[in-house]
Interface confidence: medium
């Protein structure tokens, strides 16, 4: 058998909502996955299982099933949304993300994404990590790759 | 040097509508925001929104919606501020002032100022 | 609305002495990440108006340090020492924290 590709694309949307009382951020972040079959035969892509870390926290988990079928030498878009929450010992970044001062409030996020294939009853994980900007002050909607986190940028005094 | 533009005044009968221009220079224009205040003879100071230049993106005072419409022109680096249905109330001076963007809080923010354009609302 | 209040319309001062100008806010304007979001502002005479201080104490490019800003989160003060007739106009504190900005009232410094 030839190889399956997964590519971490990157997020495609961020909607982001306040709980005031709670000093809450709700985050759904929408994510896009390209995934090549390199065989002459079709996969299933039996499941897609997500988690999002803030400040290696988990913040967010998500699993799709029974999502599609890649016939052979063929590529598929995938986007799935991972519900996120920024609450509790991290309720100090609400006043971050909702500091009207800031223009961007961009937090660093680890995105993690397991994608299981199965062919001919064999099945196979694939496994990306991925540091990516997201806004927490705003919706934003992404270029593919516009939110990659590259390295930490100094602001210029 | 940083120099904010404003024409001096400008007289409009009761019910037109003005645009109030101002004109950036001395700095990078998609920076910073831009806000207005108004002041009315005698009186203090109102702010009465900004606008990002950026991307366009806007916040006004609820006092002055629907009338006022902020925009920005990029490649003039021009700041414009639409004022409709103008009565007596509207006679003020208006400015234009500047703020840092971005993801920057707020340092030295409306740190230059326009001289102000006076619209008087007369028959 | 945050409401920003100077209670005092004017206050007269003899060059030289020092003078204090206050400003309340109805909530305080002390974020959690240290910062007070409050300026002062003169406007002299027939003049567009000058950034004094920003987020409460911090003097502005340019301003002299006869010039302080001080307070608490709710309560603000102006202190200018050593009065010059220059210093004459308008003070406005004005708030930051929340849209829509606020200013206040102002203050005229007069000289006796």
């Known amino acids: 058998p030839r190889s399956i590709d997964v590519k971490y694309i990157g997020v495609k949307s961020a909607y982001v909502s306040y709980d005031v009382q709670k000093r809450t951020i709700y985050l759904n972040i929408t994510n896009t996955l390209n995934i090549t079959n390199n065989n002459y035969y079709s996969v299933e892509v039996e499941n897609i299982t997500a988690q999002v870390q803030f400040s290696k926290t988990v913040i967010g988990k998500a699993r799709l099933n029974n999502i599609t079928i890649i016939g052979p030498l063929d590529m598929k878009q995938i986007d799935y949304t991972v519900p996120t929450v920024i609450a509790e010992e991290m309720s100090y970044m609400y006043d971050f993300c909702t500091l009207i001062s800031i223009k961007v409030h961009n937090i660093v996020l680890m995105m993690q994404v397991t994608v299981t294939t199965t062919y001919f009853g064999h099945s196979e994980q694939i496994s990306q990590e991925r540091y990516q900007y997201v806004d927490c002050g705003r919706n934003t909607t992404y270029q593919l790759g516009q939110s990659e986190y590259l390295n930490v940028l100094q602001p210029q005094q | 040097q940083v120099q904010l533009q404003q024409p001096g005044a400008e007289l409009v009968k009761p019910g037109a509508s003005v645009k109030l221009s101002c004109k950036a220079s001395?700095?990078?224009?998609?920076?910073?925001?831009m806000h207005w205040v108004k002041q009315r003879p005698g009186h203090g100071l109102e702010w009465i929104g900004n606008?990002?230049?950026?991307?366009?993106?806007?916040h006004y005072n609820q006092n002055f919606r629907g009338k006022a419409t902020l925009t920005v022109d990029k490649f003039s680096t021009t700041a414009y501020m639409h004022l409709s249905s103008l009565t007596s109330e509207d006679s003020a001076v208006y400015y234009c002032?500047?703020?840092?963007?971005?993801?920057?809080?707020?340092?030295?923010?409306?740190?230059?100022w326009g001289q102000g354009t006076s619209v008087t609302v007369s028959s | 609305d945050i409401v920003m209040t100077q209670a005092a319309p004017s206050v007269p001062v003899t060059p030289g002495e020092s003078v204090s100008i206050s400003c309340r806010s109805s909530?305080?304007?002390?974020?959690?990440?240290?910062?007070?979001?409050l300026f002062w502002f003169l406007q002299r005479p027939g003049r567009s108006p000058q950034l004094l201080i920003y987020?409460?104490?911090n003097l502005a490019s340019g301003v002299p340090d006869r010039f302080s800003g001080s307070g608490s989160g709710t309560a603000f003060t102006l202190r200018i020492s050593r009065v010059e007739a220059e210093d004459v106009g308008v003070y406005y504190c004005?708030?930051?924290?929340?849209?829509?900005?606020?200013f206040g009232s102002g203050t005229k410094l007069e000289i006796k």
């Open positions: 606008i990002d230049p950026s991307d366009s993106d806007t």
């Open positions: 002032a500047r703020s840092r963007g971005g993801t920057y809080d707020y340092g030295e923010a409306m740190d230059y």
């Open positions: 004005m708030q930051h924290l929340e849209y829509p900005f606020t």
């Open positions: 987020r409460m104490s």
């Open positions: 909530k305080s304007l002390l974020h959690t990440n240290g910062n007070t979001y």
């Open positions: 001395g700095y990078t224009f998609t920076s910073y925001w």
